[in-house]
Every structure is written in structure tokens, then in C-alpha cells.
């Protein structure tokens, strides 16, 4: 059985719309499926590597690494998106290209970085971890590390980095797929919102999903005692 | 307010050092992405970039110069230096410190300037 | 090192007439910066990335270009105008000028 709840909420393009969330209902009335891997059902995505997962999340990465940062022209905030999904009446997409990005580092002005933009989150404004010396971030925003301490600057005079960002990485079903969304449309999907990433690349969902010991490699699967709990 | 005020010996001979000072406010060379550059102007002349220093004591010298050229800071004074080795009259010139800044821009620019202290190289 | 010529050296204009001095690059170069010195008075920028304005330049300034030709234009030329103006590249060590146009008042 299926029980399905519809209701207003907030979307990345700033409106109210209607969204249906799909539950599957415990046929035995207990658990719902999320809350039995998270208590260490066999769920064999948990265990060992699941194919299906793994190309949902290179496709989603593929996806990731040609984004670029859609700031709405009234100001109202900005999301992380496909070149696609921003409005080219209402908005800017800013989105590095041929030689429009910024130098890898002060010491290498020759080569731009051509990954990126990325909404609130610049190698020029990270203090930690810092893009210099031996730890320059890759030109491939999706190998790009979380920022946990911005420069200390009210505004950077970025597009990307002074504007309100709306959205940010939500892990949503067993699935472990992400998606960039608001606080309040993942909630409702009764997922996992991450205040701390900007990018889907730098969270890892099925780690979340499956609860317990976190995984000894983000992205490796290795939860075999969960043979033994169930 | 961002002020930067340079200063110097004024007169000095051939084969001397000159050593200048760039005593800034507004500003912390502490700070992530703040830089100070020393560019000079001949009278008269057009403006040639010297040296700069950043944050985390980075340092860039102008290659045609760079024998005699060693720039550092004083952090906690608000302060950045240049000492240029074995001078010449071909350096009497106005020295300006300017700050830099990546504000809004790819690369960064010297977005404030000092006022200059002029230098003169005479025996 | 990259080698900035700008033209033309010295040039004269009418209050309200419209001013375009160009800097060419021997290589090509990302963006260009304008600075503008008056006399007796240190510089100060006026355009980064080769087009944005800098805080406090009235907008009858522009700077356009790419590659190895950028320009700066005065839209109508005022008396406080008058001043010599420089170009710069950061896209390469070492950081170069262009030698200045000078603009004089007519």
C-alpha cells in the first residue's frame, strides 16, 4: 500500500508548488522501509556495491560537473543548476568557460578554471581548506572539497558568492540520490538536508541512508554485519 | 576607511640600499586574499611594477629586478617593506604601495593606492 | 613578459566629446585594468576584468576588449578628465603597464 501526501512547498525557483510524497506504507504496520535499514534490515545496497547506485551517481556527478550557479536578477537568492533550468530572462547563470574563469592559483595565471561556478563556495574565498601551494582544488568542481571557513568579508563582489543561496544538497530515498533543493521541499520529501555542502559531490547519501557505522570509504558499501542483525 | 602611506630616505647614493615602508590602515595583510605591491614612476615616466607580497607571505618580484629586490611584512604593525640593494640614479623614482584586492575580479588589481614618496639617487 | 602599447600617446578633447584610447597586448591576455592619474595625484583604478567599473568612477567610463585589443572609452569628456591614463595585465609574472596615453583638455 501507498500513502500519499500532497502539500505547498517552496521550490528551488522560489515559488510554491504542489508536491505529492509517495510513502510506501509496512504492509504489518511498523517501520516504514527507511527506518528498517537504518535499524539493519538486509538491505544489500548497504552491503556491497549496487550497480544501479553507483551509475545513478556517476550520471548525477556527470551532471554536477557542468552546473553552474543561477542567481535571480531580483536578488531573491541563488540555487546551483543546469544551464537548462535558469531562466535566461530572469536570472544570470554564472558558469566559467574558455577564459572567463579565474586563474588556478596566484602563482599559475596562465591556466583558468573552466569547472564552476559554484553558489557560495569559491577557491578565492575559502580559508579552510585553502586552494594554494601543494592543495590547489582541481579544476572539476565535484572533487572539490566542502568549505568550512569562508574569508571573513561581508561581500566578495562574486556573483556566485554575495547572493542568497536557496538550495543545497538533499539525500532523498533508499536510493541515496541527491538532488540540490530548499530545507523545506526536502523535509517534506523526509530527506536529509546538508547545511554544510554545496555541491551533491561532496555528500555522501547512501552513507546516510543506511545509517549505523558509517562506511570506511564514503563510497564503498561495507556494512556485512548487517547479515548477523537482522 | 583603506589609507596606505609610504615613506622613505629621500636622497641616498649609487650602491646604497634603499629601504621603504608601507604603513597601512583599513586593512589586515592577515587577512585572506589581501596582497601590498610596491610600483614605481620615473618623472615623468609610466608606472612599473616592483614586487608584492600576500597574506601568507607569498611573495613576487619582478624579474628584471629581482637580484635586488626582497619585500616582507610586519602583520601586526600594519606594515609591509622593500629594500632595493645597490641603487643607481636609473631608480630615482616615486614609490607607491597599493593594496590589493580580487574584489569582484578573476585576478586581483591594486584597488587603493598611497600617496607616493619620492626617491632620489644622487652622488 | 607581456608588452603593453598604448595609443595614442597624448590626446586632446572638448568637454562632451567622446573619448576611445586602446592597449594593444604583444600576447593575448584574459582581462585589462585602466588606471587613472592625475597630475601630482597617485593612480587609481578605474576599470578590472577588462569591463566592470570600479566603486566611485562615473559611468560615462567603458572598457571593453579581449584577447590582445582593449580600449577605454569616455563617453563625454569633462574637464576633471584630463589625466594620464595607464593599462595593466595580471595575466602573466611579470605584472606589466602600458607606458599611458595622456588626455588633455581642449
Known amino acids: 500500500a501507498q500513502h500519499v501526501t500532497t502539500q505547498l512547498v517552496l521550490r528551488n525557483k522560489g515559488v510554491y508548488e504542489s508536491v505529492k510524497y509517495i510513502q510506501q506504507e509496512n504492509f504489518w504496520i511498523g517501520p516504514s522501509s527507511i527506518d528498517l535499514i537504518h535499524l539493519g534490515a538486509k538491505f544489500s545496497p548497504c552491503i556491497r556495491k549496487d550497480q544501479q547506485i553507483e551509475q545513478l551517481v556517476l550520471r548525477e556527478r556527470d551532471l554536477e560537473r557542468d552546473s553552474g550557479c543561477c542567481v535571480q536578477n531580483d536578488h531573491s537568492g541563488c540555487i546551483q543548476t543546469q544551464r537548462k533550468d535558469c531562466s535566461e530572462t530572469l536570472a544570470t547563470f554564472v558558469k566559467w568557460q574558455d577564459d572567463t574563469g579565474p586563474p588556478m592559483d596566484k602563482s599559475d595565471l596562465g591556466q583558468k578554471r573552466t569547472s564552476g561556478a559554484v553558489c557560495h563556495q569559491d577557491p578565492r574565498t575559502c580559508e579552510e581548506p585553502a586552494s594554494s601551494g601543494a592543495h590547489i582544488w582541481p579544476d572539476d568542481i565535484t572533487k572539490w572539497p566542502i568549505c568550512t571557513e569562508q574569508a571573513k568579508s561581508n561581500r566578495t563582489g562574486f556573483l556566485h558568492m554575495d547572493c542568497q543561496i536557496k538550495g543545497r544538497p538533499c539525500c532523498i530515498s533508499t536510493k541515496g540520490s541527491c538532488e540540490i533543493t530548499t530545507r523545506e521541499y526536502c523535509e517534506f520529501m523526509h530527506g536529509y538536508f546538508h547545511e554544510e555542502a554545496t555541491l551533491c559531490s561532496q555528500v555522501h547519501c547512501l552513507d546516510k541512508v543506511c545509517g549505523l557505522l558509517p562506511f570506511l570509504n564514503p563510497e564503498v558499501p561495507d556494512q556485512f554485519y548487517r547479515l548477523w542483525l537482522s | 576607511q583603506v589609507t596606505l602611506k609610504e615613506s622613505g630616505p629621500g636622497i641616498l647614493q649609487p650602491s646604497q640600499t634603499l629601504s621603504l615602508t608601507c604603513s597601512f590602515s583599513?586593512?589586515?595583510?592577515?587577512?585572506?586574499?589581501?596582497?601590498v605591491g610596491w610600483i614605481r614612476q620615473p618623472s615623468g615616466k609610466g608606472l612599473e611594477w616592483l614586487a608584492h607580497?600576500?597574506?601568507?607571505?607569498?611573495?613576487y618580484y619582478n624579474s628584471a629586478l629581482k637580484s635586488r629586490l626582497t619585500i616582507s611584512k610586519a602583520t601586526s604593525k600594519n606594515q609591509a617593506f622593500l629594500k632595493i640593494a645597490n641603487v643607481d640614479t636609473a631608480d630615482t623614482a616615486t614609490y607607491y604601495c597599493?593594496?590589493?584586492?580580487?574584489?569582484?575580479?578573476?585576478?586581483?588589481?591594486?584597488?587603493?593606492w598611497g600617496t607616493g614618496t619620492t626617491v632620489t639617487v644622487s652622488s | 613578459q607581456v608588452v603593453l602599447t598604448q595609443s595614442p600617446a597624448l590626446m586632446s578633447a572638448s568637454p562632451g566629446e567622446k573619448v576611445t584610447m586602446t592597449c594593444s597586448a604583444g600576447?593575448?591576455?584574459?582581462?585589462m585594468y585602466w588606471y587613472q592619474q592625475k597630475p601630482g595625484s597617485s593612480p587609481r583604478v578605474l576599470i578590472y576584468?577588462?569591463?566592470n567599473l570600479a566603486s566611485g568612477v562615473p559611468a560615462r567610463f567603458t572598457g571593453s576588449g579581449s584577447g590582445t585589443s582593449y580600449s577605454l572609452t569616455i563617453s563625454r569628456m569633462e574637464a576633471e578628465d584630463a589625466a594620464s591614463y595607464y593599462c595593466?595585465?595580471?595575466?602573466?609574472?611579470?605584472?606589466?603597464f602600458g607606458a599611458g596615453t595622456k588626455l588633455e583638455l581642449k
Open positions: 607580497i600576500w597574506w601568507d607571505d607569498e611573495k
Open positions: 600576447s593575448s591576455v584574459s582581462c
Open positions: 595593466q595585465q595580471w595575466n602573466s609574472y611579470p605584472l606589466t
Open positions: 576584468d577588462t569591463s
Open positions: 597599493a593594496r590589493i584586492s580580487n574584489y569582484g575580479s578573476n585576478y586581483w588589481y591594486f584597488n587603493v
Open positions: 583599513g586593512f589586515s595583510l592577515s587577512t585572506f586574499g589581501m596582497g
